[in-house]
């Protein structure tokens, strides 16, 4: 038989990029992988040149992953470099309690990262904590915004915060820079991930900083702190927005009223909603100066009139193990206005 | 091959409800961030919503905000548009379409579906 | 939000005619601007993104240019499949938006 071998030659103009080696020095770091790989294109009949990512100028492939403990020098063999994106997962977990209770860890995306010609899309800590023994918070270089329908966020990147335990479906939102959330305390396990949706995000990387500490185990799913501005309204919401409150989860909002000022709550909708198939839905509002609080049943009552709150005041949102459909999502926002006269 | 399926259209009385679905197949849906775009009869195009690939983000146009919920169901290569109380000024034909990418600028739609009537009129 | 305003609205030619749509945007978009066709009781097609790159299997004939926030379509010699309405939509925000459409009819 006659072997017949068919093969094409590439031969493409390097941009600029290609000519330069970068170092990506990943040795002091633990427990973190980086991947370059091509971004999802639907497939096309056309012919696309080749775009690749080399290893120490030698070993080139579509794909590339860098992982920690090492220093790795890599160049691109590439026509377009937008063709390319990279994900990157680090794992920050405590094992002994006793080691890691009150120790803080800073969330940012390293600068040799951040200088490669390559679209970041997603920064991933995965946050691990013994269970029942400790749990995390989140404190951010700046206030953050939640992204909601009324108010989304129009910042070059955001913070996804979802529960890491695989067999819980929670996913408490998107974060970005520029609004009242002070800080996010979770229960356990979760994925923060930094995800960013323009250029400009290398222009803005000053602004991303989350760090996390391990503090003592509590039982909420989430508590969320918030330092209103006298300037905009906060929109709030509960987290798995869409999808509803899982069951028999509890979250508490910690709002903190300045003494000059008075506070608006406004619910956006007249019910909850929900419709529980075993236990109830309720709705603590409480006064935290004098502990004075209002019980709403989430299930039967109807959500409360706008109110106003002369000093910082907890909302706790309880849910109860809802019929499917009927779940518990709830959207409120918070105004301060300068107090008028002084009711203390 | 790439193909978008829109369905459940139809003639609605303003203030009700309407859920429209579209079914995707011949690419991986899970990758890619899905919109509606709508057109009003004899009228222009008029981007509506889009959810990001994995569901985490949405964005919605002034016109349907706080009436509209899109989201996506990525094991069933769905996506919804959940439209409540509907006004006259929503009737147009809807379209769903995939965005060309992820990532950063790549909003714009390589493949679009046949588009679905929605009526409001009482 | 970005507003887009095409002109003209209508533009009657003939088949081998040179043809320019003109596409402003009211801030800048950079090249953050694609073009699509569409035909009546059709969805639109996807012709050009990032102002000037086509979309593979476009006839070369269509073309695209502009930065910041004047763009144009040209089509360089109009053929019988060419008649249609053309629809800019920048992409540079998150609120999306077109343009009001221009229709090419047959002179």
């Known amino acids: 038989g006659i072997l017949r071998l068919q093969f094409q030659v590439l031969v493409q103009h390097p941009q600029n990029e290609s000519n330069k080696i970068y170092v990506v020095d990943l040795s002091n770091e633990r427990a973190m992988s980086l991947t370059i790989e091509p971004r999802p294109v639907k497939q096309s009949r056309k012919f696309v040149p080749g775009c690749f990512v080399c290893l120490e100028s030698r070993t080139c492939s579509s794909n590339l992953t860098l992982t920690s403990g090492s220093k790795h020098k890599i160049s691109f063999l590439c026509d377009d470099l937008t063709r390319l994106w990279m994900n990157v997962e680090k794992t920050i977990s405590c094992t002994d309690h006793r080691y890691c209770q009150r120790k803080s860890y800073s969330l940012q995306v390293p600068s040799d990262i951040l200088h490669l010609p390559v679209e970041l899309h997603d920064f991933s800590w995965k946050l691990l904590v013994p269970k029942d023994r400790l749990s995390l918070v989140l404190v951010p270089a700046q206030k953050l915004q939640q992204h909601t329908h009324e108010k989304p966020c129009n910042t070059s990147f955001s913070y996804l915060v979802a529960s890491a335990i695989p067999s819980q479906d929670l996913y408490f939102g998107s974060f970005c820079p520029g609004g009242s959330i002070k800080q996010i305390q979770v229960k356990q396990n979760i994925s923060v991930t930094l995800r960013t949706f323009a250029p400009s995000f290398q222009q803005e990387a000053s602004r991303q900083g989350l760090t996390v500490s391990f503090i003592p185990y509590f039982k909420e799913e989430g508590v969320f702190t918030v330092t209103p501005d006298t300037k905009s309204k906060v929109y709030l919401r509960t987290p798995n927005w869409d999808r509803g409150l899982p069951s028999l989860t509890s979250v508490s909002w910690n709002i903190s009223v300045p003494r000059d000022q008075v506070a608006c709550l406004t619910f956006f909708k007249e019910r909850s909603g929900v419709v529980c198939q075993t236990g109830r839905a309720f709705m603590i509002i409480q006064e935290q100066r004098t502990r004075a609080e209002e019980i709403f049943s989430l299930d039967e009552d109807v959500l409360p009139k706008p109110s106003f709150h002369h000093h910082s005041f907890w909302v706790n949102i309880s849910n109860c193990s809802p019929t499917s459909g009927k779940q518990l999502d709830l959207l409120f926002s918070v105004t301060l206005t300068p107090r008028t006269v002084d009711l203390t | 091959q790439v193909q978008l399926v829109e369905s459940g259209g139809g003639v609605v009385q303003p203030g009700r409800s309407l859920r429209l679905s579209c079914a995707a197949s011949?690419?991986?849906?899970?990758?890619?961030?899905m919109h509606w775009v709508r057109q009003a009869p004899g009228k222009g195009l008029e981007w509506v919503a889009v959810?990001?690939?994995?569901?985490?983000?949405?964005y919605y146009a002034d016109s349907v905000k706080g009436r509209f919920t899109i989201s996506r169901d990525n094991p069933k290569n769905t996506l919804y548009l959940q439209m409540n109380s509907l006004r006259a000024e929503d009737t147009a034909v809807y379209y769903c379409?995939?965005?060309?990418?992820?990532?950063?600028?790549?909003?714009?739609?390589?493949?679009w579906g046949q588009g679905t009537m929605v009526t409001v009129s009482s | 939000d970005i507003q887009m305003t095409q002109s003209p609205s209508t533009l009657s030619a003939s088949v081998g005619d040179r043809v320019t749509i003109t596409c402003r945007a009211s801030q800048s978009i950079s090249t953050w601007l694609a073009w699509y066709q569409q035909k009546p009781g059709k969805a639109p097609k996807f012709l050009i993104y990032?102002?000037?790159s086509l979309e593979s299997g476009v006839p070369s004939r269509f073309s695209g240019s502009g930065s910041g926030t004047e763009f144009t379509l040209t089509i360089s010699s109009l053929q019988p499949d060419d008649f249609a309405t053309y629809y800019c939509q920048q992409y540079s925000g998150y609120s999306l938006t077109f343009g009001g459409g221009t229709k090419v009819e047959i002179k």
């Open positions: 011949g690419f991986t849906f899970s990758s890619y961030g």
């Open positions: 959810v990001w690939y994995d569901g985490t983000i949405k």
């Open positions: 990032k102002a000037s």
């Open positions: 379409a995939s965005q060309y990418s992820s990532g950063w600028h790549t909003d714009f739609f390589d493949v």
